[in-house]
């Protein structure tokens, strides 16, 4: 699987999950989140050659089409597969509020 | 929705489903399929700017991150959302066989 275990410990050039830290205040303009100040969101990057972690029958067809038509603009793209939640704390007035934000951290990628 | 109804009738530059005809023999090297000779597979293409059909909480965060960091390589990607099956006919010896190939035709796209 193109997950953090594999991708972070290799120099994989093809589609893989890459490290990305997002600072809520600086990178998103969300000043009101108290904790955490930011988080390891990660992102997916890299080419999707034929047979590389293809998601559906269609992406297999498209990768094969690319083999036959190398200059074509139609190609599978490296996108998140497994996503995990992130808990945050913010204040509503003086009262702290904890929320679980779903689908915030990329754990693995796929060619779609 | 970034579907064929909208995308095929507009000159949309952002992520949208685009027309692509795949010839089984020429484009995939699949000489054994009897019918059809090819099909309208379509494909997804176009940038994924802020708020453009974002798929998950993560893709919203990434699009917002991109607004603050325009040169970043981390960005949502335009990929298939709704896929449809394609029936094919091929011969096993003299016997025709009909199969429904799932997830073969792109009907709409999303930014993931």
């Amino acid at each position: 699987a193109l997950d953090t275990n594999y991708c972070f410990s290799s120099t994989e050039k093809n589609c893989c999950v890459r490290q990305l830290y997002i600072d809520f205040r600086k990178d998103l303009g969300w000043k009101w989140i108290h904790e955490p100040k930011g988080y390891h969101a990660n992102f997916c990057l890299g080419p999707c050659p034929y047979i590389w972690s293809l998601d559906t029958q269609y992406s297999k067809v498209l990768a094969l089409y690319n083999q036959h038509n190398p200059g074509a603009s139609a190609a599978p793209c490296c996108v998140p597969q497994a996503l995990e939640p992130l808990p945050i704390v913010y204040y509503v007035g003086r009262k702290p509020k904890v929320e679980q934000l779903s689908n915030m951290i990329v754990r693995s990628c796929k060619c779609s | 929705a970034l579907d064929t109804n909208y995308c095929f009738s507009s000159t949309e530059k952002n992520c949208c489903v685009r027309q692509l005809y795949i010839d089984f023999r020429k484009d995939l090297g699949w000489k054994w399929i009897h019918e059809p000779k090819g099909y309208h597979a379509n494909f997804c293409l176009g940038p994924c700017p802020y708020i453009w059909s974002l798929d998950t909480q993560y893709s919203k965060v990434l699009a917002l991150y991109n607004q603050h960091n325009p040169g970043a390589s981390a960005a949502p990607c335009c990929v298939p959302q709704a896929l449809e099956p394609l029936p094919i006919v091929y011969y096993v010896g003299r016997k025709p066989k009909v199969e429904q190939l799932s997830n073969m035709i792109v009907r709409s796209c999303k930014c993931s």
Epitope: L28, G29, W30, K31, W32, Y90, Y91, V92, G93, R94, K95, K97, E99, L101, S102 | Y50, I51, Q57, K60, V61, L64, Q67
Partner: antibody, heavy 121, light 107 residues
Framework: EVQLVQSGAEVKKPGASVKVSCKTS????????MNWVRQAPGAGLDWMGQ????????NYNEMFEGRVTLTADTSTSTAYMELSSLRAGDIAVYYC??????????????WGQGTLVTVSS | DIVMTQTPPSLSVSPRETASISCRAS??????????MHWYLQKPGQSPQLLIY???NLESGVSDRFSGSGSGTDFTLRISRVEANDTGVYYC?????????FGQGTK
């Protein structure tokens, strides 16, 4: 230029629901809390609640007894306020107002033009 | 809930004079070194507009004839060299405690 444009005036029967929209432009919708404030005729301002459009987190004023529902559509940069079980006391101008951005509860730096809701049998 | 009480309820001021409006909170609205008190003006037939942020910070585009002061429970809005265009209802607002609340207004 930041703009908040609200839907038009509504006339509703007692017990019905009303849904007011607030279409925004000129800023990044997913960066700011959106508040809803109401003003009864000749009266002051009452804060109803707020929503963070990026993921739909909400905080409500208990005074509205769970009758108010706030939603947001990030694809169109539009916020919505629905008030149910309408009664005569709900006759008011309803405003959407953007939070300043430093806190969840905050000052409000841009306001919609207001939507008059009339409740009458 | 924090109750905001404004005085006076109404005020008539001659042009070029100074006007003062008071706002008293039922408990302190100071936290983390800030006073969570803001001032708005609602002109006739219009939406409210933010004048002062965090007790004393002038909002961008607002005339410097407006100034705010105070901390804890007692706050004041001053309008120097009053103009006819300043006519309207002035509201204070706190956001130190949920629910956010407004004063009843000073006309």
């Amino acid at each position: 230029e930041v703009q908040l444009v609200q839907s038009g005036a509504e006339v509703k029967k007692p017990g019905a629901s009303v849904k007011v929209s607030c279409k925004t432009s000129g800023y990044i919708f997913m960066k700011y809390w959106m508040n809803w404030v109401r003003q009864a005729p000749g009266a002051g301002l009452d804060w109803m609640g707020q929503i963070f459009p990026a993921w739909g987190s909400t905080n409500y004023n208990e005074m509205f007894e769970g009758r108010v529902t706030l939603t947001a559509d990030t694809s169109t940069s539009t916020a919505y306020m629905e008030l149910s079980s309408l009664r005569a006391g709900d006759i008011a101008v309803y405003y959407c107002a953007r939070g300043y951005g430093n806190y969840a509860l905050d000052a409000m730096d841009y306001w919609g033009q207001g939507t008059l809701v009339t409740v009458s049998s | 809930d924090i109750v905001m009480t404004q005085t006076p309820p109404s005020l008539s001021v001659s042009p070029r004079e100074t006007a003062s409006i008071s706002c008293r909170a039922s408990e302190s609205v100071d936290s983390y070194g800030n006073s969570f008190m803001h001032w708005y003006l609602q002109k006739p037939g219009q939406s409210p507009q933010l004048l002062i942020y965090l007790a004393s910070n002038l909002e961008s585009g607002v005339s410097d004839r407006f100034s705010g002061s105070g901390s804890g429970t007692d706050f004041t809005l001053r309008i120097s060299r009053v103009e006819a265009n300043d006519t309207g209802v002035y509201y204070c607002q706190q956001n130190d405690e949920d629910p956010l609340s407004f004063g009843q207004g000073t006309k």
